[in-house]
Amino acid sequence: SDKLYQRKEPVISSVHTKVKGIAEVTENVTEGGVTKLGHSIFDTADYTFPLQGNSFFVMTNYVKSEGQVQTLCPEYPRRGAQCSSDRRCKKGWMDPQSKGIQTGRCVPYDKTRKTCEVSAWCPTEEEKEAPRPALLRSAENFTVLIKNNIHFPGHNYTTRNILPTMNGSCTFHKTWDPQCSIFRLGDIFQEAGENFTEVAVQGGIMGIEIYWDCNLDSWSHHCRPRYSFRRLDDKNTDESFVPGYNFRYAKYYKENNVEKRTLIKAFGIRFDILVFGTGGKF
C-alpha cells in the first residue's frame, strides 16, 4: 500500500546476465542434388552475443550462405530483379534491396532466369525461409542467471536480487521459488503465455520485468524483487511488416589464400530486462 509519510525515490539498477546450456543441431542443407546432414554442438559462445544495455540475445535459428567470396555474380532473382537485356542494369547502381553494386550487365542466374550482375560477396544470399522447426529449438531448456544490483542513493541503500542463502541449482518458479534468479527460457515464455517453439523460428523480443517495491523503514523493512514476463515484439507475424527478430553476421576465413566468409542470418530471442520500482523511507 502507498505510505504517504514516506519519501520515495526511483530505483537505480545494473544488470548482468549469464546464459548456460548446450544444443545439438542437425542441419539439413540441400544444394546441387546433395542433401548434407551436419551434426554440431552449440555452446554459449556459439548462440549468445554481447548486447549493450540490459539485454541478451539467444540464437534459436539460422540460415547460412557458405563460401562467399568478393567477385562478380548474378544477383538473387527476387521479385522485380530479373532482366532480359543490359539496358535494365545500370553500372554503379546500388539498389537498397540488392547485395552489391551493378556492373551494367544482364547475366544468366540459372537456366530460366537472368538478373543484373553485381560486384558483391558471391554467390549472393538466397531469400530462404527460416527452417521450421527451429534448429536450436532445444534452447527452451537453456537457463539464464540474472544478477541485479540496485541502489537508492537518497536513502543510502544498496541490495541485490541474489541472496547469500540462495541455492545455485534452483530454478525460478512463480509459486515454489519466486526469489530464484535462475530462469529456464521455456518457463519465461510459458509465464508470458507464449509458445517458445513457435517464436524460436522467426525470433522475437521478450521482456523480463523486475519490480522492486521497497519499504526501507527499519520497523517494517522489505526489499525483494518481483519478476514478471511479457512479449515485447509484434506477435502477429503475418501482419507485421518484418516479422520476428534477426540480424546477419559473418565468419571470415582463408581458403587457398582467398578470403571467404560464411554469412549467417541469425534468428533468436532478445531478452530485455526492465528494472523499475521505488524505495520508500520515513
Epitope: 544444394e31 542434388g33 546433395v34 542433401t35 548434407k36 537456366k111
Partner: nanobody, 128 residues
Framework: EVQLVESGGGLVQTGGSLRLSCAAS????????IAWFRQAPGKEREGVSI???????FYADSVKDRFSITADGAKTTVFLQMNSLKPEDTAIYYC??????????????????????WGQGTQVTVSS
C-alpha cells in the same frame, strides 16, 4: 534417354592407382549430382564419392584423401581417381546420377527423390 557407361576398372596391386571414367548422356551434369557407389562380394552397396551439380565434392570416410572425383570441361564425363588402393577397395564400382545424402562421412541415395540412374558397373580388384 539417360545413360551412364563406366570404364577404367581392372586389376591393380596394393598401393597402386586406377582412374575410373563415367560417360554420361541424355542429361547434363547441371541436372543431377553424380556419385560413385561400390559393392564388394557379400557386402552392401556403399557410397564412395559425390560430385554435386554445382561442383562440390563429398567423400566417404573410408576413401577420404585417397580418392578424387572430377568432371571434364564439357561436363559429360566424370572421373574417379583412386590412389593408395587397398584390398578392401575391391568391388564393382557403379556410376549413379541422382540425388544423394551426405551424413558425417557416409553417402547414400536420397530415395525420397527417386532411385537414380545407374550404370552397369566396372570391376576393380586390388591384390595384396
Amino acid at each position: 534417354e539417360v545413360q551412364l557407361v563406366e570404364s577404367g576398372g581392372g586389376l591393380v596391386q596394393t598401393g597402386g592407382s586406377l582412374r575410373l571414367s563415367c560417360a554420361a548422356s541424355g542429361f547434363t551434369l547441371d541436372d543431377y549430382a553424380i556419385a560413385w557407389f561400390r559393392q564388394a562380394p557379400g557386402k552392401e552397396r556403399e557410397g564412395v564419392s559425390i560430385l554435386s551439380s554445382i561442383g562440390k565434392t563429398f567423400y566417404a570416410d573410408s576413401v577420404k584423401d585417397r580418392f578424387s572425383i572430377t568432371a571434364d570441361g564439357a561436363k559429360t564425363t566424370v572421373f574417379l581417381q583412386m590412389n593408395s588402393l587397398k584390398p578392401e577397395d575391391t568391388a564393382i564400382y557403379y556410376c549413379v546420377a541422382g540425388h544423394f545424402v551426405y551424413n558425417d562421412g557416409a553417402i547414400s541415395l536420397n530415395t525420397a527423390r527417386g532411385s537414380g540412374f545407374w550404370g552397369q558397373g566396372t570391376q576393380v580388384t586390388v591384390s595384396s
